[in-house]
């Protein structure tokens, strides 16, 4: 019958001839009376046997993320009858594994968004990278992340990738941030490879700011003949939040003599100071009014922000008319 | 903090006209909101304001004092002036300029006041 | 114009005791438009309340102010020796006109 061992190969051997191992027949008594020969996919080409001794020879280099293992087929022949002296077999040639791939990401460009303010723990993304070496050879495959750019505001599971933070961020200090995340195969010992993806994290806005407004006092003026509904004047606050956590309301705190009002303007976010009621310079010719601000949506979790509504006075100075 | 000094001669003759400025400093004559007056006190007697002005020029007067009062803004000097025609001896007074306050038309800072006397 | 009268033209008190000085109004103005200031001899008046309880900075609590329509009052809870001085009222609604002055004097 046939002997030999398991074939094994390992990839990217730089020799012109690496011997793998030997086929040979039991019957074999080594007087070279046996022809052995090897048949198949990558015989003669990639795989030669020595035809007297039946020893296999690898005479090119391997690469196994190419091509894993190789099935070749036997047969031994006695050269004096020309006669199979074995049935043909067939046998396999394993090529092993070598650490020559690195880890790579495959799914980037990675980009993320989450809230601002967001809890430390919260969970960004998960990336994730592959290495084409094998999985159940050592280590060659085994991959660890760790962050090389994004402290202190995120850190990374060095086993699954994913993104978590870990420090509350303001997108009103910045808005997005660029992490860098290595892969290293090996789970890091000597001899790893590496490979490294970016991820943009964008912050997206929560209201956590209120309206302020631009001046602590505004002076306006108007006419004594102005009728009912006159606009005398707008008054503005500013939010350092985007889209709909900045859109405010304006109201009148405080007006004894109950002549204004003050509409909102919601395309242009002011305050439009209104004459409620006809002026008499005679009667009254300065007013005094206080005006505060408030947001529009705020969600109970963020009414810690906006305890305290942002005021402005308004000084109002009656023009006279002169009366026919 | 604001503080505000007023200059000017101490003795006017009457018929004459009396010139008064009041310099800022601390603080900007521009500040939007805010009107500078110049308000008078005769010896031994009460307090009367006299007209107001906005660093854009706006002036507002006392309806009593209205033709022979003028008050002008120079926002290059921070200063604003004073100048009261056809003086008699009943304008002689302490002259105080002040500005307004923050949350109304009240007199939050107020000069040293300066005397003017009207005498031939 | 707005006419205000303040009395009494002079109130005699001891230190200690509590000052109540009126300022009358001829027409009503808001409650708003009304303050007080305090004028000690030699000196530019100094503003105590606005509108018409709101102290001003840096006065003391025992200065207050009420009021409203056409009358006001400032109380000064406990005098002390350097509240003995001239308080006039002020409105700033139409115009703006002074009281005549009240003198808090010591008995």
């Known amino acids: 019958g046939w002997v030999w061992n398991q074939f094994f190969v390992p990839e990217e051997m730089n020799t012109t001839s690496h011997h793998i191992g030997q086929l040979r027949s039991d019957l074999d008594n080594g007087n070279n009376s046996f022809q052995y020969k090897l048949l198949g996919a990558g015989a003669g080409s990639t795989f030669i046997i020595d035809e007297r001794t039946g020893d296999i020879y690898a005479i090119q280099k391997l690469d196994r993320e190419e091509r894993s293992l190789y099935i070749l087929r036997a047969q031994v022949i006695d050269i004096a009858t020309g006669r199979a002296v074995e049935p043909e077999s067939e046998f396999v040639i394993k090529v092993s594994d070598i650490n020559d791939n690195e880890p790579k990401f495959l799914d980037e460009p990675y980009e993320a968004i989450v809230p601002e303010m967001s809890p430390e723990g919260t969970l960004v993304i998960q990336v994730t990278a592959s290495d084409a070496d094998d999985p159940s050879s050592g280590n060659n495959a085994r991959l660890l992340y760790s962050l090389l750019q994004g402290q202190p505001y995120f850190s990374v599971e060095p086993t699954t990738g994913v993104i978590r933070i870990s420090s509350k961020m303001d997108r009103e200090l910045q808005d997005e941030y660029w992490v860098i995340i290595q892969a290293k195969d090996m789970i890091g010992q000597p001899g790893a490879l590496s490979g490294t993806t970016s991820v943009l994290i964008k912050l997206s806005d929560v209201n956590d700011n209120k309206p302020i407004f631009k001046e602590s006092l505004y002076r306006l003026t108007v006419s004594e003949s102005a009728p009912t509904g006159t606009s005398i004047g707008t008054i503005m606050a500013y939010d350092n939040d985007i889209g709909e956590n900045a859109e405010m309301d304006y109201s009148i705190e405080e007006d004894d003599s109950q002549t204004f009002d003050i509409i909102t303007n919601h395309e242009t976010q002011e305050g439009i100071v209104i004459l409620k009621k006809k002026v008499d310079f005679e009667h009254q010719n300065h007013y005094g009014i206080r005006a505060k601000v408030k947001n529009h949506h705020v969600p109970e979790q963020l009414m810690k922000y906006h305890t305290e509504a942002s005021t402005t006075f308004i000084k109002i100075q009656v023009e006279d008319v002169d009366e026919p | 903090q604001v503080q505000l000094q007023e200059s000017g001669p101490g003795l006017v003759k009457p018929s004459e006209t009396l010139s008064l400025t009041c310099t800022v400093s601390g603080g900007s004559i521009s500040s939007s909101g805010y009107y500078w007056s110049w308000i008078r006190q005769p010896p031994g007697k009460g307090l009367e304001w006299i007209g107001y002005?906005?660093?854009?020029?706006?002036?507002y007067y006392n309806p009593s004092l209205k033709s022979r009062v003028t008050i002008s803004v120079d926002t290059s000097k921070n200063q604003f002036s004073l100048k009261l025609s056809s003086v008699t001896a009943a304008d002689t007074a302490v002259y105080y300029c002040?500005?307004?306050?923050?949350?109304?038309?009240?007199?939050?800072?107020w000069g040293q006041g300066t005397l003017v006397t009207v005498s031939s | 114009e707005i006419v205000l009268t303040q009395s009494p033209g002079t109130l005699s008190l001891s230190p200690g005791e509590r000052a109540t000085l009126s300022c009358r109004a001829s027409q009503s103005i808001s409650s708003s438009y009304l303050a007080w200031y305090q004028q000690k001899p030699g000196q530019a008046p100094r503003l105590l309340i606005y509108g018409p309880s709101s102290r001003a900075t840096g006065i003391p609590d025992r200065f207050s102010g009420s009021g409203s329509g056409t009358d006001f009052t400032l109380t000064i809870s406990r005098l002390e020796p350097e509240d003995f001085t001239v308080y006039y009222c002020?409105?700033?609604?139409?115009?703006?006109?002074f009281g005549p002055g009240t003198k808090v004097d010591i008995k």
């Open positions: 002020q409105q700033y609604g139409s115009s703006f006109t």
């Open positions: 002040a500005r307004d306050g923050s949350s109304g038309w009240y007199f939050q800072y």
């Open positions: 002005i906005y660093y854009t020029g706006s002036a």
